[in-house]
């Protein structure tokens, strides 16, 4: 058993049929010694008396808010949550496995640049009695500070018969060094509590591996005289790290016909312009990627050929 | 060439070679063998290799002030990785395919380090760690880890030379 926060405790249980459970001793936070009784949740049934209460925690019915009283007055509360371990593996019932980029990916994170700011998000089908708490650091043995905001509900989607809820959080490394080569990964830890179930989820990454630039901006076409060719030009996104002579991007320019089956013409360039043939009803798209490190491509910025 | 005592390197040549190194490091990575282990192996090896750190002067301001600190750090790393790529980790079982980009990568590391340091002058180099893989699966794991950290190292080096070529070239 360990303390999650003041008066909230997590009991770790091996979860299998007829498991013996864990013996837990609760102590009433009071100078009083006599006449103390204990109850669980809203029930008025007295579970025991005395300054301490010993319980055998085996299932969710044994978890909840234990209260000690004296003469009708509440002295203190202890909320017990359960953390299940099945066959040596902690349960992951609350969050949905996003399966990208690999199985058992519950948290996904992205950064728009090297400033040390990043966003993480996760999915659940649970709509009520759900709380999240997020902590982060650079490295784990001698952790350096990363400050995270509160997790917020950022999207709701309908998936078949189920509703899916997306939560996200923004974090910022306290003393980021954008030009350095990271040697210690960022650790993100999410505590999830649904009713009386506690779970924790972690992700470990380097900012360089979660970089996804915003799409190029100001995408423009300039027809070339007496030709079907056009000059496409664009600019670095505002959110990308500066100076651009140091934090350089590379670009992919694509000409795509109306039908998805039509052959795509692609050009790769380090410049912020390219000359392509503009077909009728086609569109021109440009996306960006770090020039020197193959992290994610940005989403496409597009303009119609006409 | 980065002649000791403060004269500039051939920024444009270094830029071209470092960008080639980036491409090679990424093309070599998936080719060192099928690898599930990389998903589970933790990042402890990163403690054993030289990193371009915050105080090394490899940021745009540091380069403007005095690029020598940064160039020395890059040179150290290049020599270090060149030694690793020539070690038993890459030459031992399982054998690399004859056309593996690791050979080209090895040669290019040496080429860039020579551009930075002419014959007759020696910057201090870092000792190559004893990673002591005794099993082929351990070598395979180390190859992945070394190439992963090399990708990060050469990305910073390429940024340095790109910025130098754009802003510090005579």
């Amino acid at each position: 058993i360990w303390e999650l926060k003041k008066d909230v405790y997590v009991v770790e249980l091996d979860w299998y049929p007829d498991a013996p459970g864990e013996m837990v001793v609760l102590t009433c936070d009071t100078p009083e010694e006599d006449g103390i009784t204990w109850t669980l949740d809203q029930s008025s049934e007295v579970l025991g008396s005395g300054k301490t209460l010993t319980i055998q925690v085996k299932e969710f019915g044994d978890a909840g808010q234990y209260t000690c009283h004296k003469g009708g007055e509440v002295l203190s509360h202890s909320l017990l949550l359960l953390h299940k371990k099945e066959d040596g593996i902690w349960s992951t019932d609350i969050l949905k496995d996003q399966k990208e980029p690999k199985n058992k990916t519950f948290l996904r994170c992205e950064a728009k640049n090297y400033s040390g700011r990043f966003t993480c998000w996760w999915l659940t089908t649970i709509s009520t009695d759900l709380t999240f708490s997020v902590k982060s650091s650079r490295g784990s043995s001698d952790p350096q500070g990363v400050t995270c905001g509160a997790a917020t509900l950022s999207a709701e989607r309908v998936r078949g018969d189920n509703k899916e809820y997306e939560y996200s959080v923004e974090c910022q490394e306290d003393s980021a060094c954008p030009a350095a080569e990271e040697s210690l990964p960022i650790e993100v830890m999410v505590d999830a509590v649904h009713k009386l179930k506690y779970e924790n989820y972690t992700s470990s990454f380097f900012i360089r591996d979660i970089i996804k630039p915003d799409p190029p901006k100001n995408l423009q076409l300039k027809p070339l005289k007496n030709s079907r060719q056009v000059e496409v030009s664009w600019e670095y996104p505002d959110t990308w790290s500066t100076p651009h002579s140091y934090f350089s991007l590379t670009f992919c320019v694509q000409v795509q016909g109306k039908s998805k089956r039509e052959k795509k013409d692609r050009v790769f360039t380090d410049k912020t312009s390219a000359t392509v043939i503009c077909r009728k009803n086609a569109s021109i798209s440009v996306r960006a990627q770090d020039r020197y490190y193959s992290s994610s491509w940005s989403e496409w910025a597009s303009v119609p050929c006409s | 060439r980065a002649v000791p005592g403060g004269s500039s390197p051939a920024w444009t040549q270094c830029q071209q070679l470092s960008q080639k190194l980036c491409t090679l490091a990424w093309s070599a990575h998936p080719l060192v063998g099928h690898m599930d282990l990389r998903e589970e192996g933790d990042e402890e090896t990163t403690n054993d290799v030289p990193h371009i750190q915050c105080g090394d002067g490899c940021d745009p301001q540091g380069l403007r002030d005095n690029s020598q600190f940064c160039l020395q750090r890059i040179h150290q790393g290049l020599i270090f990785y060149e030694k690793l790529l020539g070690s038993d980790i890459f030459t031992g079982e399982p054998s690399l395919l004859p056309d593996s980009p690791v050979g080209q990568l090895h040669a290019s590391l040496l080429g860039l380090s020579q551009l930075l340091q002419p014959e007759g002058h020696h910057w201090e180099t870092q000792q190559i760690p004893s990673l002591s893989p005794s099993q082929p699966w351990q070598r395979l794991l180390l190859r992945f880890k070394i190439l992963r950290s090399l990708q990060a190292f050469v990305a910073v080096a390429a940024r340095v030379f790109a910025h130098g070529a754009a802003t510090l070239s005579p």
Partner: antibody, heavy 121, light 111 residues
Framework: QVTLKESGPVLVKPTETLTLTCTVS????????ISWVRQPPGKGLEWLGV???????NYNSGIKSRLTISKDNSKSQVVLTMTNMDPVDTARYYC???????????????WGQGTTVTVSS | DIVLTQSPDSLAVSLGERATINCRAS??????????MHWFQQKPGQPPKLLIY???NLESGIPARFSGSGSRTDFTLTISSLQAEDVAVYYC?????????FGGGTKVEIK
Amino acid sequence: QVTLKESGPVLVKPTETLTLTCTVSGFSLTNYAISWVRQPPGKGLEWLGVIWTGGGTNYNSGIKSRLTISKDNSKSQVVLTMTNMDPVDTARYYCVREGDYGSYAGAMDYWGQGTTVTVSS
Amino acid sequence: DIVLTQSPDSLAVSLGERATINCRASESVDYYGISSMHWFQQKPGQPPKLLIYRASNLESGIPARFSGSGSRTDFTLTISSLQAEDVAVYYCQQANKDPYTFGGGTKVEIK
């Protein structure tokens, strides 16, 4: 499908040399390492040695001086030679494939049925 | 050599009950976060069969009631609900250092 089959003498006299052949099918010896493991009657398993994909070998230090493992990739055969046999070498000898280096980390994923070798005069 | 000590030597469990076998190594069998510990099942007259590789990965075709956990020096094989066909001897094996070594085996029987 993947198979490994051991063949060789059933009975060997003390001081003689044992030669066992393992013939494999369903995979190539250029892609997988082969180990030899033995099991004395009613006892546990003992690893003898391995031949890697490139032909290099590692042996159990306890019997290294008596053991040679070689292979012929084109014939899909691995040969174990063990000199100066003794009654304590009486065991079932298994030829075993080591799983893909990058996934299995030295786990042996396919075993032959084994061949029982008795050392007796 | 790395010595692997299995416990218990034998285990009698009722059908449908849980069986747990431990394997302790004389030194760590982890290499940069990878545990080179594997589990085998051997039935009478048959060669051993790989169940779990790298401490916790279920070999294809093996029922999900088998699971493995642990790292460094302490490892566990669990059969969550014992079936009649699980009666066998179970061995752990390390491949972190030469020579590869096996545990002494744990015999699992039905109570």
